[in-house]
Amino acid sequence: ETDEEPEEPGRRGSFVEMVDNLRGKSGQGYYVEMTVGSPPQTLNILVDTGSSNFAVGAAPHPFLHRYYQRQLSSTYRDLRKGVYVPYTQGKWEGELGTDLVSIPHGPNVTVRANIAAITESDKFFINGSNWEGILGLAYAEIARPDDSLEPFFDSLVKQTHVPNLFSLQLCGAGFPLNQSEVLASVGGSMIIGGIDHSLYTGSLWYTPIRREWYYEVIIVRVEINGQDLKMDCKEYNYDKSIVDSGTTNLRLPKKVFEAAVKSIKAASSTEKFPDGFWLGEQLVCWQAGTTPWNIFPVISLYLMGEVTNQSFRITILPQQYLRPVEDVATSQDDCYKFAISQSSTGTVMGAVIMEGFYVVFDRARKRIGFAVSACHVHDEFRTAAVEGPFVTLDMEDCGYNIPQTDESTLMT
């Protein structure tokens, strides 16, 4: 339901100092400037709601312009413990410690936080991305090496008067950015401790955080141009659905992806796109300024609402799911990559979704809010939307219960 309760001090209003504090682009992530140590060392840090470690490059790497030098910080404390984080592809490993951390364009506070000093990595840092570390904003349950390592945001809330909430406005440019343009461009805003009304239009609609590990939510229905995909809603959340600023694409479970692509293909059948386009391998291009946005459908995800049997929908445009790409070989054209892809780990609402909306991570009330972003890319005919309420029954059945594999927690 919409957020119409009385204003609470410090929770909403204007956060001028934090507006426009993000840079980057959806393909390589959005980052915020942070300082670590004493004297402060400035680093650009990827904002990632899909993980829970604060980890920074702490050794030379070919893709890093700078890195955290622990030996130069008088406030660094070694925890004498290693951390190893493998991904499906790639990994990083490092040494745990704590140090003083602040966000120059954030709340005027300094906190002592856990820091993983990355000493070795593979397929983690991105050449040309301009960030040197990652700020995992999710919950302790998925922190490495285990849930006893307090995430940065928990430390921030515990040690200061900052309310337990943050909000993100990620602004896709709508056109490709070269390196110098990224450095000069505005990428969006991370409002720590509140909601800034200037960053969205219309009302905020909230969906419950199903479980505090990832920012897990429940999708109850999917539509392509208003046509229901008509799948068992469990499929949409198999094995989970999360909101993840550190992922570029909208990633969908295999069955859902196949159904969605079939429907998007059918809706856009006036043009014949190569199979490689739907796989994310081939670009499609049009003469500059002639992209036929109208032939591509809108995509609506219905999310569980805060009230029983009530849902709301968020609708994205092709301007969100076709990602502009610069390729010198085809520079006279506007070229795009299909930014919806297949997942084996559930639905991931990445930058493709988030660039359409102002997203409020209201940890205090265990909910995530969505409103139409004031910076989303659209055309004169269609706009991204957040609409409700809709009546949806048996929404609890849409959640998938991951089988418990840890014997210590099995009932005997």
Partner: antibody
Framework: EVQLQQSGAELVRPGTSVKLSCKAS?????SYWIHWVKQRPGQGLEW???????????KYNQKFKDKATLTVDTSSSTTYMHLSSLTSEDSAVYYC?????????WGQRTLVTVSA | DIVMTQSQKFMSKSVGDTVSVTCKAS??????VAWYQQKSGQSPKSLIY???HRYSGVPDRFTGSGSGTDFTLTISNVQSEDLADYFC?????????FGGGTRLEIK
């Protein structure tokens, strides 16, 4: 400037294997797939397969799925093609090429000669 | 697999002429066809994508046309440096396939 630098010519014995490399520069390596193409003397071009450097996902031409294995090392922006159980039929020029729309960029060629 | 047929293996033209190289797909590939030029001992060079779009830096003497199953590469005002093999490629579906090539000789 986008460049694909391939490894040098190989003279190999029948029944053995060979690993060719293709080092990319001038663009964000993980943003574009890399393809491999075979050309036998005086013949046309055959697509072997492709790899997505962002997650190592591969797709092969059925004809080459037991012959070629594609891998990637993002730390060095290099793609590899391993060719196994070599016969005279595998004597050819091999190219890597980068995705975009079709194959806008090609490597400079690697000649593989299989001979006893 | 989609078969791309270039029926003319050789073509001979004089400098200044116009030449049309044709390519036929065994099934509808939309406009998802590219053309490449390969000079002796060199790698293929990309000329045309999406049937009719020139890659950056390709002279406008090279034009592509066609859709569905029939495609043409036209080279107007042929120059001596155009001596090469020309290949079409469909990238509509996997496996990607190439035509057998057409060799342009200069009289």
């Amino acid at each position: 400037e986008v460049q694909l630098q391939q490894s040098g010519a190989e003279l190999v014995r029948p029944g053995t294997s060979v690993k060719l490399s293709c080092k990319a520069s001038g663009y964000t390596f993980t943003s574009y797939w890399i393809h491999w193409v075979k050309q036998r003397p005086g013949q046309g071009l055959e697509w072997i397969g492709m790899i997505d450097p962002s997650d190592s996902y591969t797709k092969y031409n059925q004809k080459f799925k037991d012959k070629a294995t594609l891998t990637v090392d993002t730390s060095s922006s290099t793609t590899y093609m391993h060719l196994s159980s070599l016969t005279s039929e595998d004597s050819a020029v091999y190219y890597c090429a980068r995705s975009g729309v079709a194959f806008p960029y090609w490597g400079q060629r690697t000649l593989v000669t299989v001979s006893a | 697999d989609i078969v791309m047929t270039q029926s003319q293996k050789f073509m001979s033209k004089s400098v200044g002429d116009t030449v049309s190289v044709t390519c036929k797909a065994s099934q509808d590939v939309g406009r998802n066809v590219a053309w490449y030029q390969q000079k002796s001992g060199q790698s293929p060079k990309s000329l045309i994508y999406s049937a009719s779009h020139r890659y950056s830096g390709v002279p406008d003497r090279f034009t592509g046309s066609g859709s569905g199953t029939d495609f043409t590469l036209t080279i107007s005002n042929v120059q001596s440096e155009d001596l090469a093999d020309y290949f079409c490629q469909q990238y509509n579906s996997y496996p990607y396939t190439f035509g057998g090539g057409t060799r342009l000789e200069i009289k």
